[in-house]
């Protein structure tokens, strides 16, 4: 297994990720963002929610 | 493949304004910032600004403030710098560089020529 | 903005010569620093980034290293082919250049 060396973004990056941390995946030349609960995308930009099914009138 | 193509070379007046384009294949620039930078013939490179194409943010080196404008249309994968009140320093090549989702990615650069 | 001081201007060296370029922050940029290569009519080639972390495809023979405000970019052995200008950039806060090191050879 390769080990990906990581650090924190640089101050340049401010901002980039909207709503999770922005790590920076020195082997790889990248910035990525790690999203929050609940968010998606390249920068963490999508909202999605989860819908959970309702209880059926046979489980009541 | 991933591609930067950035518009023609350029000739203006003194006085005038030049607008560079620069457009994205094979990515969203949305994902990324698109920088700007610029080298006068015979001399260095010289960062001028910055913006995030998802939220519109620009940020612009001191010395070109007020006389440079960065936009993007995330429409059409679009950036583009516009530079006014040109003068005869500010003959160079202008190159449009991604960052973000890879370490600068360079377009291959637009002469702009300002010469009376 | 963060100052980007880069020396010497120029230097001359023969083949297999080593190499040192170094560049001065004015304040801490954190190792956010990443140096490249441009030879005439061509585009930078980005060769180090993150202080010391060679690019998929460069030589061996290019180094990079330091921290706070002191980086050296360093050719162990220099070649023929390494002819061209070479420019620091610090990315910890917006972007700054080094004026650049013409390198030639004797």
């Known amino acids: 297994v390769a080990q990906v060396s990581i650090t924190k973004c640089s101050s340049d990056m401010n901002g980039y990720c909207l709503h999770g941390q922005c790590i920076y995946l020195v082997d790889m030349s990248q910035n990525y963002c790690r999203c929050e609960v609940g968010y998606t995308g390249v920068r963490c930009e999508h909202f999605f929610l989860t819908v959970h099914q309702p209880l059926s009138k046979e489980y009541v | 493949q991933d591609q930067l193509v950035q518009s023609g070379a350029e000739v203006k007046k003194p006085g005038a304004s030049v607008k560079v384009s620069c457009k994205a294949s094979g990515f969203n620039i949305k994902d990324t910032y698109i920088q700007w930078v610029r080298q006068a013939p015979g001399q260095g490179l010289e960062w001028m600004g910055r913006i995030d194409p998802l939220r519109g943010n620009t940020k612009y080196r001191e010395k070109f403030e007020g006389r440079v404008t960065i936009t993007a249309d995330t429409s059409t994968n679009t950036a583009y710098m516009e530079l006014s009140s040109l003068r005869s320093e500010d003959t160079a090549v202008y190159y449009c560089v991604r960052s973000g989702t890879l370490f600068d990615f360079w377009g291959q650069g637009t002469l702009v020529t300002v010469s009376s | 903005d963060i100052q980007m001081t880069q020396s010497p201007s120029s230097l001359s060296a023969s083949v297999g010569d080593r190499v040192t370029i170094t560049c001065k922050a004015s304040q801490d940029i954190h190792k956010y620093i990443a140096w490249y290569q441009q030879k005439p009519g061509q585009a930078p080639r980005l060769l180090i980034q993150?202080?010391?972390t060679l690019q998929p495809g460069v030589p061996s023979r290019f180094s990079g290293s330091g921290s706070g405000t002191d980086y050296t970019f360093t050719i162990s052995s220099l070649q023929p082919e390494d002819i061209a200008t070479y420019y620091c950039l610090q990315y910890d806060n917006r972007r700054t250049f080094g004026g650049g090191t013409k390198v030639e050879i004797k």
């Open positions: 993150y202080t010391s």
